[in-house]
């Protein structure tokens, strides 16, 4: 029972113009050329939009005009391979226009650049954008598209859109407050933190339909449905995996209209049939479209049925498990994830998934045994050490988090990391161990029943970032490994790993630990990143520095940005101070 | 909620024929499984046979296997019991059950049911 449109259009363009008005359809057509093209100018892709909206209309009035019936891809492939630059600023992207469809927008996809080498973004003063935004609103929002979109290429777009208007809204209320920075600054920073926290959560999306396919897409679907709404039947649930998985296939794949599109439908089916789903849908389907379908994706789950009755009638005890797992493989094993993550909201999806999986390998070996339900019989025993695993290494990690607060918690997963793959690049390291970090601000403070879901399965979103920036530059086998082998035990995969004793220390270089003046005018996030790459490069040079050791460093460190950012003549004391830091550093490590 | 009602019972002859028919009504039963169970006089409830939901698995007791056959009708929304070959000992009153949200027969417990028909005799005698 798919809830999506079947019928054939003459003109998909025209159709998806009409559905989704010419507003989303502009920003959905800008957002997919800023990801495709990210080092192209603002206004290049202003007019390479303009000119597909103008093309959309004359189609819209004549669906049989000329091109009309061309596909999505074909149109916006087309007009990507105008670009004069095509060439020089792309280098052999550019080849992908010699490709016809699909396979070149496979190529396309290929070389979206997850660490493009773009600017940061830098705050303007708030006068100074709030008559830009003043000025001219539309510019001002589409400049926002752009630059989020060609930054972070894989993100969902219809969910930008609900950015967007969030910011223009933010615009809108703090330009005319009496206190404009008090009232706008605390509102992007929301924006900018939720913005890389929803791009990361669609990177894992797009990773797990590209690297792992479609049927590891829905396992994770399945589990996570069930958990929000375990009171909907399993037909239900897979009714909504499969129209969520074509929703996210489209966007990562770069139908950005069909996919926002798509997903408005959705939105609708699951508003219209919320008594069989779930009872906590009912102030989101009262909000409009944007915020209705991120409302959905964020609900809180629903509350269990009572009185379910035990898993081990139907999947352990059944003189049936052997015949339904033979029939019907994964409708079987959808069923026992259905009905294990239905009655686990406590547990990750990622662990959800391992049971699953030890369930799934378990009846492989037994169903061709001799006495199959012998061989079976206890499958449950095999979750326990499943289970206690991750529980205690959030216990563990919730301690030490609880000690250290959270910079010096990020510390120690950045010398824990660095150990185990000293080859990734330094400035991947801190990003990822700072990631990893936070999980114990963002998870610890909450009750043991959802910790582990909060814990784990945020883990799986910053490890998916290290997994992706790994990719484009692989420099760890040790990395390659935990990133392909597996996409559910990617974390259990780098909490084993150990000191990496085949890595050859780095050469020490003094520049690497010289600082200047600029580090007191930094805000104290960009100190506390100065800091932890210094600490980073020192386990590089000296892996086998014990926590003392590197704790005495860093304190002294510390102390040195301090005095000489309170001494009058700072740069002095950086340049004579330092000297004398590196070589007691050297001296303390034994470098 | 579903309401089931079971018809066709009768008297046969043993290697009679007979074809039950179960009309659920309330909810469609065509992504959920659905079995027969009968009880004979002074016995348990015992399954006979059940078709899986959305995947049309079927499941049959050793004593009926070969001889009975389970179908539904998905338009009318009613499950049907094709029995040949009866013997005496299929005497029983004859139960259709649902087991909502089961696209299969994970069990032949009839505790795992929910919903139940008033039953349709069966008496196969000369």
């Known amino acids: 029972r798919g809830v999506f449109r079947r019928d054939a259009h003459k003109s998909e363009v025209a159709h998806r113009f009409k559905d989704l008005g010419e507003e989303n359809f502009k920003a959905l057509v800008l957002i997919a050329f800023a990801q495709y093209l990210q080092q192209c100018p603002f206004e290049d892709h202003v007019k390479l939009v303009n000119e597909v909206t103008e093309f959309a209309k004359t189609c819209v009035a004549d669906e049989s005009a000329e091109n009309c019936d061309k596909s999505l891809h074909t149109l916006f492939g087309d007009k990507l391979c105008t670009v004069a630059t095509l060439r020089e600023t792309y280098g052999e992207m550019a080849d992908c226009c010699a490709k016809q469809e699909p396979e070149r927008n496979e190529c396309f996809l290929q070389h979206k650049d997850d660490n493009p080498n773009l600017p940061r973004l830098v705050r303007p003063e708030v006068d100074v954008m709030c008559t830009a935004f003043h000025d001219n609103e539309e510019t001002f929002l589409k400049k926002y598209l752009y630059e989020i979109a060609r930054r972070h290429p894989y993100f969902y777009a219809p969910e930008l859109l609900f950015f967007a208007k969030r910011y223009k809204a933010a615009f809108t209320e703090c330009c005319q407050a009496a206190d404009k920075a008090a009232c706008l600054l605390p509102k992007l920073d929301e924006l900018r933190d939720e913005g890389k926290a929803s791009s990361a959560k669609q990177r894992l999306k797009c990773a797990s339909l590209q690297k792992f396919g479609e049927r590891a897409f829905k396992a994770w679907a399945v589990a996570r449905l069930s958990q929000r709404f375990p009171k909907a039947e399993f037909a239900e649930v897979s009714k909504l995996v499969t129209d969520l998985t074509k929703v996210h296939t489209e966007c990562c794949h770069g139908d950005l209209l069909e996919c926002a599109d798509d997903r408005a439908d959705l939105a609708k089916y699951i508003c219209e049939n919320q008594d069989s789903i779930s009872s906590k849908l009912k102030e989101c389907c009262e909000k409009p479209l944007l915020e209705k379908s991120h409302c959905i994706a964020e609900v809180e789950n629903d509350e269990m049925p009572a009185d379910l009755p035990s898993l081990a009638a139907d999947f352990v005890e059944s003189k049936d498990v052997c015949k339904n797992y033979a029939e019907a493989k994964d409708v079987f094993l959808g069923m026992f994830l259905y009905e294990y993550a239905r009655r686990h909201p406590d547990y990750s999806v990622v662990l959800l998934l391992r049971l699953a999986k030890t369930y799934e390998t378990t009846l492989e070996k037994c169903c061709a045994a001799a006495d199959p339900h012998e061989c079976y019989a206890k499958v449950f025993d095999e979750f326990k050490p499943l289970v206690e695993e991750p529980q205690n290494l959030i216990k563990q990690n919730c301690e030490l988090f609880e000690q250290l607060g959270e910079y010096k918690f990020q510390n120690a997963l950045l010398v824990r990391y660095t150990k185990k793959v000293p080859q990734v690049s330094t400035p991947t390291l801190v990003e990822v161990s700072r990631n990893l970090g936070k999980v114990g601000s963002k998870c610890c403070k909450h009750p043991e029943a959802k910790r582990m879901p909060c814990a784990e399965d945020y883990l799986s979103v910053v490890l998916n970032q290290l997994c992706v920036l790994h990719e484009k530059t692989p420099v760890s086998d040790r990395v390659t490994k935990c990133c392909t082998e597996s996409l559910v035990n990617r974390r259990p995969c780098f909490s084993a790993l150990e000191v990496d004793e085949t890595y050859v220390p780095k050469e020490f270089n003094a520049e690497t630990f010289t600082f200047h003046a600029d580090i007191c005018t930094l805000s104290e996030k960009e100190r506390q990143i100065k800091k932890q790459t210094a600490l980073v490069e020192l386990v590089k040079h000296k892996p086998k520095a014990t926590k003392e050791q590197l704790k005495a460093v860093m304190d002294d460190f510390a102390a040195f940005v301090e005095k000489c950012c309170k001494a009058d003549d700072k740069e002095t004391c950086f340049a004579e101070e330092g000297k004398k830091l590196v070589a007691a550093s050297q001296a303390a490590l034994g470098l | 909620e579903v309401q089931l009602l079971e018809s066709g019972g009768g008297l046969v002859q043993p290697g009679g024929s007979l074809r039950l028919s179960c009309a659920a009504s309330?909810?469609?039963?065509?992504?959920?499984?659905v079995a027969w169970f009968r009880q004979a006089p002074g016995k348990e409830r015992e399954f006979v046979a059940g078709?899986?939901?959305?995947?049309?698995?079927?499941y049959y007791a050793d004593s009926v296997k070969g001889r009975f056959t389970i179908s539904r009708d998905n338009s009318k929304n009613t499950l049907y019991l094709q029995m040949n070959s009866l013997r005496p000992e299929d005497t029983a009153v004859y139960y259709c059950a649902v087991r909502p949200g089961r696209p299969l027969i994970t069990s032949r417990d009839a505790n795992l049911y929910d919903y139940w028909g008033q039953g349709t005799l069966v008496t196969v005698s000369s």
């Open positions: 309330g909810r469609t039963v065509s992504s959920t499984a």
């Open positions: 078709i899986g939901g959305s995947v049309d698995i079927t």
